[in-house]
Each structure stands twice: as structure tokens, then as C-alpha cells.
Interface confidence: medium
């Protein structure tokens, strides 16, 4: 069996890995919505009870003319309506929520479950970054423009672990490292010096960098090579 | 007449007051239950290994796993036997790769490596089965009829599969479905 090149890393399986759990957006918002509804109901409830007590104190045991009594009945009627609305809200909302959750789950499944996190559809996520894994070959400059048009940047490699991961995914691709000539240092897209070894650097015609099976190599900027784009989350 | 009117209004007031009180107690009970329900049963609880991203339409994966189309994949670079691979995936609350279709690992299609997947032959069912017990679709690997049933299956993300001794060591891919 043919083996792909160097990949120096693998899963470290601790006995009890600690993991965070977060709620998905839809449900989190739904829960918040419910809490808001409840808070709203509580406020009305407090207001209603205050009104009720207040009126009770003011008008208790007095032989009143009909107008104030009408007022009391009106206030009590409004309070009843508010309370009924609150009761209906609390009874109906959770079942609606469950229904909405079930529907959204169903919809997500039927939509081929394509979209993940903050990344565009068909991109992959890894370690807080989104990656577009291209299949088209472009020159280095064309690749740079293609990634810009996708609101991202030509693949940058921030650390050794990322390089190892990318080497598993794709044997070779352009990276955002270049030099003006063989007399100039290798720099990243933000103009910082790139300190790591780039193979074949002594060849004056090879001034753009490629990730090739866990190695960084220099290549002719005009060569057509697969490109990948990256966007940090 | 004024006395009758006053009595009538008092009667209505009393009735409404009782209704208000009963509604208030109902509301109190409902509020208590709702809060209890919210704290005990969130609308959706992710599995222990899955870290769901806030503000995410779908999902994010554990560190060092790849998220793609709402699945998480761990792509190993260590070679293991098929059984070892299966246990390693299980220990991460995932399973050896079960393919829905041959473009599932589209993002790895230029890889030349073969990986163990969760397919093995069941003597009992006389069929190639995925780890969850479902049968292999005959359209997935046209060559599956030539597979040696004593062997396990290694898969290359460009769509090829081959059978190898389960004791051979290969890299492997674990998969977690997030929905």
C-alpha cells in the first residue's frame, strides 16, 4: 500500500479529556426568548398584584357609588386578561419551542447538513480557522486573487501542527510566503520574515513557497499549483 | 336600585377577584415548572464529545478534528490494526468512518493514503456491514464483490477501496455525526 508522506502527529487520547459544551444557536436563542417571555409575565404579574392590593386597600369595606365599582371591575377584568394571556403564553411557548426545534432539526437534516460554524458552505473547519481546499490549479498570484475574492487569504501556516494537518488533507498547495528575489528574505503576506526552512531556496528562479507533503519548498511563482484559502475565526 | 347595582358590581368584582387569584396561582405553578424545565431539560443537549459553537448554524468539532458538512472527522497519521483503530474511535465517542457517498471526504480527494473504515464482513448476515449494522450499498464500491470476506476495508478519499488483512496497520478515520 502506498503511503502518503510525513505526518508526524496524531491524536493524544487523555483518560478523561475535558470538553466544553455549548448550546446551538437556535436553541440558545429560543431558551432566551422563553426567559424573556417569563420575565415579561413576571413583571406583569407583579404589577397586577400591586394594582390589586392597592385597590383593595383603597376601596375596602366602603359603600361606593357605581363608578368606582365599575373601575374596580374594569381593573380586575384587565388583570384577568393579562393573567390569562400569561398562562396561555407559558403553556403554548414551550410546545412551540419543541416543535420549532424538531422542525429545525428536520430541516437541517434535509438540507444535507452542509453548513458548519462560521465557515462558508463546503469549507472545512479546523482549530478555529476555515479552509477552502481548492482543486483548481493557479499561479501564485492568481491564487492570491482567488482567495481575496473569497474574503480570505492565501493559505498561511502559523505553526508546525497546522502544517502537519494540512499535509494530511492535501499533498501540495501554494502558501502565502514569497520573496522578491533569492537575495531577499522569505516573507509572509503581512510582511513579516518567515523563519522556517524552505527547501531549494538557493535556486534564484523559485521565489514563491509551496507546502509539499509536510515540507515547505520554493517553486516558480508562475507554476500552476493547487491553492487553498484560509480564514481565521 | 342603587343598592342592587352596587351588589351586582360587588358580585362581578368578587367573581373576577377569584378568577384573578386562581389565574395567579396557575401562573405561579406554570412559572415554577417552566423554570425547572428550562434548567433541567435544555432544548438540545450535545453529546459529551461535541463542542457546539455559539452563533453557529450547525457545529464545531473537538480540537484537532476536522469539521465538514456537519460531521467531525479525526484523520490519523498513526498506523493501527483495524481493531485498534475501532477502539480508538470508540474511546472518542465516535466510530470508524461510515461513508454516505464517495464524495463525503471531498476535501481530501487528493490524498494518496488509504485509511481503515468501519466496514467488515458479517458471516451471520453474509453481507458487508457498517459498524451501525447497516449494509454496504452496492453502488458505493463497485469492486466490493471481489473483496476477501476475511479482510477489512481500507479506503482512499478519492473513492478507491481495497481489502487488506485486518492485522495490517493503516491510518484510520473516525467520524462523529453532529446532527
Amino acid at each position: 500500500m502506498d503511503n502518503q508522506g510525513v505526518i508526524y502527529s496524531d491524536l493524544n487520547l487523555p483518560p478523561n479529556p475535558k470538553r466544553q459544551q455549548r448550546k446551538p444557536k437556535g436553541n440558545k436563542n429560543s431558551i432566551l426568548a422563553t426567559e424573556q417571555e417569563i420575565t415579561y409575565a413576571e413583571l406583569n404579574l407583579q404589577k397586577a398584584s400591586q394594582d390589586f392590593q392597592g385597590n383593595d386597600k383603597t376601596y375596602h369595606c366602603k359603600d361606593l357609588p357605581s363608578a368606582p365599582e365599575k373601575l374596580i371591575v374594569g381593573i380586575l377584568g384587565i388583570i384577568c386578561l393579562i393573567l390569562m394571556a400569561s398562562v396561555v403564553t407559558i403553556v403554548v411557548i414551550p410546545s412551540t419551542l419543541i416543535q420549532r426545534h424538531n422542525n429545525s432539526s428536520l430541516n437541517t437534516r434535509t438540507q444535507k447538513a452542509r453548513h458548519c460554524g462560521h465557515c462558508p458552505e463546503e469549507w472545512i473547519t479546523y482549530s478555529n480557522s476555515c479552509y477552502y481546499i481548492g482543486k483548481e490549479r493557479r499561479t501564485w498570484e492568481e491564487s492570491l486573487l482567488a482567495c481575496t475574492s473569497k474574503n480570505s487569504s492565501l493559505l498561511s501556516i502559523d505553526n508546525e501542527e497546522e502544517m502537519k494537518f494540512l499535509s494530511i488533507i492535501s499533498p501540495s498547495s501554494w502558501i502565502g510566503v514569497f520573496r522578491n528575489s533569492s537575495h531577499h528574505p522569505w516573507v509572509t503576506m503581512n510582511g513579516l520574515a518567515f523563519k522556517h526552512e524552505i527547501k531549494d531556496s538557493d535556486n534564484a528562479e523559485l521565489n514563491c513557497a509551496v507546502l509539499q507533503v509536510n515540507r515547505l519548498k520554493s517553486a516558480q511563482c508562475g507554476s500552476s499549483i493547487i491553492y487553498h484559502c484560509k480564514h481565521k475565526l | 336600585m342603587a343598592v342592587f347595582k352596587t351588589t351586582l358590581w360587588r358580585l362581578i368584582s368578587g367573581t373576577l377577584g377569584i378568577i384573578c387569584l386562581s389565574l395567579m396561582s396557575t401562573l405561579g405553578i406554570l412559572l415554577k415548572n417552566s423554570f425547572t424545565k428550562l434548567s433541567i431539560e435544555p432544548a438540545f443537549t450535545p453529546g459529551p464529545n461535541i463542542e457546539l459553537q455559539k452563533d453557529s448554524d450547525c457545529c464545531s468539532c473537538q480540537e484537532k478534528w476536522v469539521g465538514y458538512r456537519c460531521n467531525c472527522y479525526f484523520i490519523s497519521s498513526e498506523q493501527k490494526t483495524w481493531n485498534e483503530s475501532r477502539h480508538l474511535c470508540a474511546s472518542q465517542k465516535s466510530s470508524l468512518l461510515q461513508l454516505q457517498n464517495t464524495d463525503e471526504l471531498d476535501f481530501m480527494s487528493s490524498s494518496q493514503q488509504f485509511y481503515w473504515i468501519g466496514l467488515s464482513y458479517s458471516e451471520e448476515h453474509t453481507a458487508w456491514l457498517w459498524e451501525n449494522g447497516s449494509a454496504l450499498s452496492q453502488y458505493l464500491f463497485p469492486s466490493f464483490e471481489t473483496f476477501n470476506t476475511k479482510n477489512c476495508i481500507a479506503y482512499n478519499p478519492n473513492g478507491n477501496a481495497l481489502d487488506e488483512s485486518c492485522e495490517d496497520k493503516n491510518r484510520y478515520i473516525c467520524k462523529q455525526q453532529l446532527i
Partner: antibody, heavy 118, light 107 residues
Framework: EVQLVESGGGLVKPGGSLRLSCAAS????????MNWVRQAPGKGLEWVSA????????YYADSVKGRFTISRDNAKNSLYLQMNSLRAEDTAVYYC???????????WGQGTLVTVSS | AIQLTQSPSSLSASVGDRVTITCRAS??????LAWYQQKPGKAPKLLIY???SLKSGVPSRFSGSGSGTDFTLTISSLQPEDFATYYC?????????FGQGTRLEIK
């Protein structure tokens, strides 16, 4: 200048424990995977364990799995190998070696001798 | 694990000779192979990586070739300081493995 200096070797009884250290200098330690390699007297090289730059990925040779633990402290520029349940066959010179972004071991320490004997 | 078999286990040669050492992998490792030189009482020293890439600072008389399962290290013209033990190592996948070594002695 890149320097790796191992320490912590010595004589230990079978079943005993030992902790090796490797002090790194002259490079950005936190950017590199590090490895332990050993060499029994008069024998060849045997890779023992590897740890990636931020400790996310850890590997062991089958012969030491479950007994040895590799770790690192990037703040102290140090690599460690905790060796438990030592056996006579663990007697060797232990080297720490650096990787350059996936290149093989481009720098090695001078080694520290571990002798397991009763 | 991937086994690496070096041949010969030892060889005698003279200064100025051209020497070839081979390393065979039990399965394909593409070009993920390195060669090291070790002198008695010293740590190994990297000579060649990626099967054929010469590490900077290593004399050009050392060269490597091969891909897949068969690899060779060639010393075009032996110098006195080249008498040592040479090891091949695969870094295609874990566990990493070394060949058993080839001892190069003065004839």
C-alpha cells in the same frame, strides 16, 4: 546556536522510576516537535516518544507505552520523559532530538545514560 | 510498524572509494526517509532528509536517492572522517523506525 542538554540519567533498580529532562536553547522551543530516542549499549537507535509543539499530539513506541510519559514546559524550554516500571532492557543512552517543522531530527543532545540493574 | 532493513550491516572501504548503502522499507513510505551518521560516543547527525535532500552544511559527496520502498545513500569519495555508522529512518508514520545501522570501517 541550537543546544539540547539531557539530564536525569543514572542507575535505577528494575521496577523503579526516573525522570529525564532536556533543556533547550538557541531556538524557539515552543515551535518545534521534540522526540526522545535511545540507544542500548552497542546497539542501534530506537525511537521512544514524540510530542508536538503545543503537546496536542503525543506518541510512544509500543515497547514503552503505558510506562513512559513525555511532556514539555514551553515556558521553561524543557522536555521531560517520566520513566516508570523500568526494566533491564530500558538500559540505554537517551537522546532528545528536535524536529524542524516536520523535518527529521536536525539537532540532538549529547545523551544521558540510564542503567537499570539490580 | 514499518521495518527498515539496511544492507550491508558492515563494510570495509578505503579513502577515495565510492560507497553505497541501501535501505529497504517493508511498505511504501514515499520519500519520507532520512540518513544519519553516528560516530562512537557521539549523537547522530542528520545528513539527508526527504530521501535525497542534503542538509545544509553536509558535504556534497553525500547523496541520497530512492522513493517508495528502496533507498540508497552514496558517498562519492570517502574521506577519513566518514568512517562511522550510518542509519536510515522513516518518518512517514508513527511509530518512527530506524534501520539496524551499517558500520563503515577503514579497510
Amino acid at each position: 546556536e541550537v543546544q539540547l542538554v539531557e539530564s536525569g540519567g543514572g542507575l535505577v533498580k528494575p521496577g523503579g522510576s526516573l525522570r529525564l529532562s532536556c533543556a533547550a536553547s538557541g531556538f524557539t522551543f515552543s515551535s518545534h516537535s521534540m522526540n526522545w530516542v535511545r540507544q542500548a549499549p552497542g546497539k542501534g537507535l530506537e525511537w521512544v516518544s514524540a510530542i508536538s509543539s503545543s503537546s496536542s499530539y503525543i506518541y510512544y513506541a509500543d515497547s514503552v507505552k503505558g510506562r513512559f510519559t513525555i511532556s514539555r514546559d514551553n515556558a521553561k524550554n524543557s522536555l521531560y520523559l517520566q520513566m516508570n516500571s523500568l526494566r533491564a532492557e530500558d538500559t540505554a543512552v537517551y537522546y532528545c532530538a528536535r524536529e524542524e517543522w516536520g523535518l527529521p531530527f536536525d539537532y540532538w543532545g549529547q545523551g544521558t545514560l540510564v542503567t537499570v540493574s539490580s | 510498524a514499518i521495518q527498515l532493513t539496511q544492507s550491508p550491516s558492515s563494510l570495509s572501504a578505503s579513502v577515495g572509494d565510492r560507497v553505497t548503502i541501501t535501505c529497504r522499507a517493508s511498505q511504501g513510505i514515499n520519500s519520507a526517509l532520512a540518513w544519519y551518521q553516528q560516530k562512537p560516543g557521539k549523537a547522530p547527525k542528520l545528513l539527508i532528509y526527504d530521501a535525497s535532500s542534503l542538509k545544509s552544511g553536509v558535504p556534497s559527496r553525500f547523496s541520497g536517492s530512492g522513493s517508495g520502498t528502496d533507498f540508497t545513500l552514496t558517498i562519492s569519495s570517502l574521506q577519513p572522517e566518514d568512517f562511522a555508522t550510518y542509519y536510515c529512518q522513516q518518518f512517514n508514520s508513527y511509530p518512527l523506525t530506524f534501520g539496524q545501522g551499517t558500520r563503515l570501517e577503514i579497510k
